[in-house]
């Protein structure tokens, strides 16, 4: 029977007695920055080229004995997980290894930087097909390492990294914290976060997704036919590097943004037990376990979106938090969240020629998060329409008035500290779904987009009694682009998208009376692109 980890990432239609998905990543080259490797292991022989790059620190300790099999252990195993003949994910992918970790698994930022530069130069000298760079390492936060990753990513290289094994916020580590890198946490055979001794997988908003990372069978550097089980986020990252190689081999023109969106889209959703994570990290950590797409083609018709959380704003009165989409993505909506419920909303604003999502803390608040909904929408022309606070008691309204523009998201932002505490809810007039409605004291922002074949609709779910969470989901074939709460519900902590579901969170119901103040309405904007659907039918 196939190893559990390969079965886990394999869609049911591939599952026979063996793991044999079509096209094993043969058009893709994967660079591995790790320890030295045993390239003549039968699992990887002829698949991995050992480059002459080596930049490692001296081993610690006077009694350290260099033993080849120990020096090669980590890298050999990972090379096997990515492209091993027997227990590899992308059995057709070729690899190149660079040694940046010593026999104790230690490296330096400078060694990794020089390794990345080596790859960039190799790419310029001899351009090949799509490149994936696997960085199965984690150190303290490094602005310079993150910047180097950003440069390489912007040159068209896909970087995949380990989230780190410190049972901590991945944003405190590099390269895990680099937004351009695909950061991978580790789960086990029960789809639970991996525990490693007293520590375990990192988590948080800097993790893009999880992948199998416990008891992973792979090539052992002990001997040419030896196999061993290893665990950690390095193994998880190797799975995603393999999946990326498979996807890029099937669709070599995929951009980094498209690849990341597909990795997220095809992941298993909501299978991880979030109780393992610290309470304050649960909402920020993606509940996604990587998997291969069920078919190598035909995903192009879908409108792909993902949720990007900002860093925490901090508690100061005027503190703000900013969430940004990747360069190739469109910001289709913006929401905010505060655990204390004290916030002054959010707004979409231009920054460096691109829209960003900014959330505002309120006096006495413990801080806010901005939540961006980032989507792939080719040929899109999006703009933000703002209505200042209204004079009328009916509240503030704004709609998309330009011909062919559709509403993809609503945001509201206010200056007063305790907006709506004693105000009844404002009801949306029937038959006017293409507009954003808010408190009269708030300025309302509508995200309006024009793209070929784009259509959107508003879905609401209201609960009259107080409840900690109200959700509304888009149906099959539609993608959630906007998520907000209908105004008037003062105890709302915020709104955010989880996959295709809009979640509106409220304060602990025990502190809220069951008056009309308790009513909570979640508003989802669901979109689809008929143009993308037609384009994919033509391609096939």
């Amino acid at each position: 029977s196939i190893p559990w980890n390969l079965e886990r990432i394999t869609p049911p239609r591939y599952r026979a007695d063996e793991y044999q998905p079509p096209d094993g990543g043969s058009l893709v080259e994967v660079y591995l920055l790790d320890t030295s490797i045993q390239s003549d292991h039968r699992e990887i022989e002829g698949r991995v080229m050992v480059t002459d790059f080596e930049n490692v620190p001296e081993e610690d300790g006077t009694r350290f004995h260099r033993q080849a099999s120990k020096c090669d252990s980590h890298g050999t195993h990972l090379a096997g997980v990515v492209s091993g003949r027997d227990a590899g994910v992308a059995k057709g992918a070729s690899m190149r290894s660079l040694r940046v970790l010593n026999c104790q698994g230690k490296g330096t930022v400078s060694g990794t930087l020089i390794g990345l530069e080596f790859i960039r130069k190799s790419q310029l000298v001899q351009p090949v097909g799509p490149l994936v760079v696997l960085l199965p390492l984690a150190g303290g936060y490094s602005r310079v390492l993150n910047a180097a990753c950003q440069r390489l990513a912007r040159a068209g290289v896909v970087l995949v990294t380990a989230a780190g094994n410190f049972r901590d916020d991945a944003c405190l580590y590099s390269p895990a914290s680099a937004p351009e890198v695909i950061t991978v946490g580790a789960t086990n055979a029960q789809d639970q976060p991996v525990t490693l001794g007293t520590l375990g997988t990192n988590f948080g908003r800097c993790v893009d997704l999880f992948a199998p990372g416990e008891d992973i069978i792979g090539a052992s550097s002990d001997c040419s036919t030896c196999f061993v089980s290893q665990s950690g986020t390095s193994q998880a990252a190797a799975h995603v590097a393999g999946i990326a190689a498979m996807m890029l081999s099937a669709e070599p023109e995929l951009t980094l943004a498209e690849l990341r969106q597909r990795l997220i889209h095809f992941s298993a959703k909501d299978v991880i037990n979030e109780a393992w994570f610290p309470e304050d990290q649960r909402v920020l950590t993606p509940n996604l376990v990587a998997a291969l797409p069920p078919s190598t083609h035909g995903a192009g018709w879908q409108l792909f979106c993902r949720t990007v959380w900002s860093a925490h704003s901090g508690p100061t009165r005027m503190a703000t938090a900013v969430a940004r989409c990747a360069p190739d993505e469109e910001l289709l909506s913006c929401s905010s969240f505060s655990r204390s419920g004290k916030r002054r909303g959010e707004r979409m604003e231009a920054q460096g020629g691109k829209l960003v999502c900014r959330a505002h803390n309120a006096f006495g608040g413990e801080g806010v998060y901005a939540i961006a909904r980032c989507c792939l929408l080719p040929q899109a022309n999006c703009s933000v329409h703002t209505a200042p606070p209204a004079e009328a008691s009916m509240g503030t309204r704004v709609h998309c008035h330009q011909q062919g523009h559709v509403l993809t998201g609503c945001s509201s932002h206010w200056e007063v500290e305790d907006l709506g505490t004693h105000k009844p809810p404002v009801l949306r007039p029937r038959g006017q779904p293409n507009q954003c409605v808010g408190h009269r004291e708030a300025s309302i922002h509508a995200s309006c987009c024009h793209a070929p074949g784009l259509e959107c609709k508003v879905k609401e779910h209201g609960i009259p009694a107080p409840q900690e969470q109200v959700t509304v989901a888009c149906e099959e074939g539609w993608t959630l682009t906007g998520c907000s709460a209908l105004p008037g519900t003062s105890h709302v902590l915020g709104a955010y998208a989880v996959d295709n579901t809009c979640v509106v969170r409220s304060r602990d119901v025990s502190t809220t009376g069951s008056t009309s103040e308790g009513a909570v309405t979640a508003v989802a904007i669901c979109c689809r692109s008929r143009h993308l659907a037609q384009a994919s039918q033509e391609l096939q």
Partner: antibody, heavy 119, light 113 residues
Framework: QVQLVQSGAEVKKPGESLKISCKGS????????ISWVRQMPGKGLEWMGW????????HYSPSFQGQVTISADKSISTAYLQWSSLKASDTAMYYC????????????WGQGTLVTVSS | DIVMTQSPDSLAVSLGERATINCRSS????????????LAWYQQKPGQPPKLLIY???TRESGVPDRFSGSGSGTDFTLTISSLQAEDVAVYYC?????????FGQGTKVEIK
């Protein structure tokens, strides 16, 4: 049941070429390695090399490198051993055997192909 | 290359008696990653292909009578036939399968005394 069936005995002259075969059945051919083993008359077993039918990658024993070619056609679950120019010293019984990454010993053997090279 | 040396070259044992064959490897075939010895024993009867008896130095292949047992670790190994039967007349080979080239012992011929 799982079996490896080899082609029949061959009698050849020195300098001639030859390709013998080993057909796998009853299992997933591309999941297992196929090795070739030589046994000269009255002698012991000598490992010649392996092929992985999944990607047709081969690894030869230094003693046999350049002397023989191992190949496979996964569409018909068959591995081959060939010579471009036979020598009298190639006279031997040749066995194919399979092994797996999780079971790297030879659990199934072919019945053998006797190759006789004589002028 | 790992050299495998068997002793004795031939062995004559009475029916029902114990037969012991030794095998020594020029380097250890025990590996810490899984704590296994990468050593197998094969039986070859005249006119037949070899047949797997023992793998991982001491695990009996299914269908092999329990009078066959393997022991040893590292570099020194033993195949024991606890009570020799007429059908056990054959040549026995040890083999290491941890590194390439794969190597066999020269063989031990077991006969009935």
């Amino acid at each position: 049941q799982v079996q490896l069936v080899q082609s029949g005995a061959e009698v050849k002259k020195p300098g001639e070429s030859l390709k013998i075969s080993c057909k796998g059945s009853g299992y997933s051919f591309t999941d297992y390695y196929i090795s070739w083993v030589r046994q000269m008359p009255g002698k012991g077993l000598e490992w010649m090399g392996w092929i992985y039918p999944g990607d047709s990658y081969t690894h030869y024993s230094p003693s046999f490198q350049g002397q023989v070619t191992i190949s496979a056609d996964k569409s018909i679950s068959t591995a081959y051993l060939q010579w471009s120019s036979l020598k009298a010293s190639d006279t031997a019984m040749y066995y194919c055997a399979r092994d797996h990454w999780s079971k790297p010993y030879f659990d199934v053997w072919g019945q053998g192909t006797l190759v006789t090279v004589s002028s | 290359d790992i050299v495998m040396t068997q002793s004795p070259d031939s062995l004559a044992v009475s029916l029902g008696e114990r037969a012991t064959i030794n095998c020594r490897s020029s380097q250890s075939v025990l590996y810490s990653s899984n704590n296994k010895n990468y050593l197998a024993w094969y039986q070859q009867k005249p006119g037949q292909p070899p047949k797997l008896l023992i793998y991982w130095a001491s695990t009996r292949e299914s269908g092999v009578p329990d009078r066959f047992s393997g022991s040893g670790s590292g570099t020194d190994f033993t195949l024991t036939i606890s009570s020799l039967q007429a059908e056990d007349v054959a040549v026995y080979y040890c083999q290491q399968y941890s590194s390439f080239p794969i190597t066999f012992g020269q063989g031990t011929k077991v006969e009935i005394k």
